[in-house]
């Protein structure tokens, strides 16, 4: 039994069969910049007089405005089948989330099962190393953090175009530099199953002591 079935309470509607959205695809996994289409559908028997339009929601918030959705109606002698189509062109990471449909039937709100949309792409930096001025031969730290999906994201550190660590570290990564005698440029490489993203290069300057 589908838990989304409405609990009708009025005397006239007690005999109405339960209505619920059909089960969804479940989980869509795709790469950034691809197009995606999905739908939810519901069969409304003729015995139901009052139905409102289908609205699309993502992560608990209604999707309004520029989103591309179409609702199709297929009537037959028993009622009407309604299919709500949703499409996203050139998906971005911000399109990640749980999508679902809502509609009102006989003044009762019905919610579909979610469709999980997982957009995968190259690692995305949320923390990159920053330029600092350091005292000669004094230890300092640099931080690099990148995320997927897909996870995990592995980090290589680069100093003056040469890799510092032979084995990658899982993001987030902190590089402890024991000290420098001259200016150097540091960056980090973030790797996941989709490929490689390189951070900005940062100059670490040696403070001149007067």
């Amino acid at each position: 039994a589908h838990t989304a079935a409405p609990q009708v309470t009025s005397t006239a509607s007690k005999l109405l069969p339960p209505v619920a959205f059909n089960h969804t695809i479940g989980h869509i996994v795709l790469s950034e910049h691809k197009n995606v289409k999905f739908n939810c559908s519901i069969n409304i028997p003729n015995t139901y007089q009052e139905t409102a339009g289908i609205s699309w929601w993502k992560d608990g918030k209604e999707l309004l405005g520029a989103h591309h959705s179409i609702t199709q109606f297929y009537p037959d002698e028993e009622g009407v089948s309604i299919i709500a189509l949703f499409s996203i062109a050139s998906v971005q990471r911000s399109d990640n989330g749980s999508y679902f449909c809502k509609m009102k039937v006989n003044n009762r709100e019905i919610v579909s099962d979610p469709i999980y949309v997982e957009v995968q792409g190259l690692p995305y930096f949320i923390k990159q190393p920053e330029s600092v001025n350091v005292t000669r031969n004094t230890a300092f730290n640099l931080t690099c953090q990148a995320v997927g999906p897909p996870e995990p994201v592995n980090i290589f550190w680069v100093q003056n175009s040469s890799r510092v660590n032979e084995k990658p570290e899982r993001s987030p990564s902190v590089l402890t530099v024991p000290g420098l005698t001259e200016t150097a440029v540091f960056s980090c490489e973030a790797h996941n199953d989709k490929g490689l993203t390189v951070s900005k290069g940062v100059h670490i300057n040696i403070k001149v002591i007067p």
Epitope: T3, H23, G26, H27, V29, N96, G97, D113, P172
Partner: antibody, heavy 116, light 110 residues
Framework: QSVEESGGRLVTPGTPLTVTCTVS????????MGWVRQAPGKGLEYIGF?????NTYYASWAKGRFTISKTSTTVDLKITSPTTEDTATYFC?????????????WGPGTLVTVSL | DVVMTQTPASVEAAVGGTVTIKCQAS??????LAWYQQKPGQRPKLLIY???NLASGVPSRFAGSGSGTQFTLTISDLECADAATYYC????????????FGGGTEVVVK
């Protein structure tokens, strides 16, 4: 990214126990977390899930027996009134997304023993 | 809650061989199914999600298929390191139907 459970110990039946999961390298405001247990020599058993905004979902058998809550870096599983059947290794695991209950990072588990 | 039924409970195969594990859901779960590998004394490891997507670092010898109520995990070119117990798990609308695991399948490699 890592998760680690703590707080497993020997308790007597009926004594509430809280097991804690500490996470690092990711944010609980982005990812959901699940709890799964495994009795000695048995299979995996799903207990429940807390999503990124704090909504909790439980397996039917677990409702009322367990409570899941979280802070910014920890997720707690409270066993409200343990019985000997609750003796198991308890795992916490990171969900694939905010509301997605497949688990891509698991802790090593913590053993809870309920005995007189 | 959805109930997941996994078969067989145990299977034995030779190195280089192929093993097929089946998982049946008590109702349609779309493709919201994951497979895990667990070795004795270790934590489970995600192998496959969304029924057929390989998790990071998992060799392509592992393959998942199916949708709706019937799912399959196939391990080809078996290696000794594949000896483990394998579990399926639904995460379809986990807020409504739970995240039940199958009973597990022990794979013995000869």
């Amino acid at each position: 990214q890592s998760v680690e459970e703590s707080g497993g110990r020997l308790v007597t039946p009926g004594t509430p126990l809280t097991v804690t999961c500490t996470v690092s390298g990711f944010s609980l405001s982005v990812y959901g977390m699940g709890w799964v247990r495994q009795a000695p020599g048995k299979g995996l058993e799903y207990i429940g899930f807390i999503n990124n905004v704090g909504n909790t979902y439980y397996a039917s058998w677990a409702k009322g027996r367990f409570t899941i809550s979280k802070t910014s870096t920890t997720v707690d599983l409270k066993i409200t009134s343990p019985t000997t059947e609750d003796t198991a290794t308890y795992f916490c695991a990171k969900g694939g997304g905010g509301d997605w209950g497949y688990f891509n990072i698991w802790g090593p588990g913590t053993l809870v023993t309920v005995s007189l | 809650d959805v109930v997941m039924t996994q078969t067989p409970a145990s299977v034995e195969a030779a190195v280089g061989g192929t093993v097929t594990i089946k998982c049946q859901a008590s109702q349609s779960i779309g493709n919201a199914l994951a497979w895990y590998q667990q070795k004795p004394g270790q934590r489970p490891k995600l192998l496959i999600y969304a029924a057929s997507n390989l998790a990071s670092g998992v060799p392509s010898r592992f393959a998942g298929s199916g949708s709706g109520t019937q799912f399959t995990l196939t391990i080809s070119d078996l290696e000794c390191a594949d000896a483990a117990t394998y579990y399926c798990q639904t995460y379809y609308a986990i807020n409504r139907y739970g995240g039940a695991f199958g009973g597990g399948t022990e794979v013995v490699v000869k």
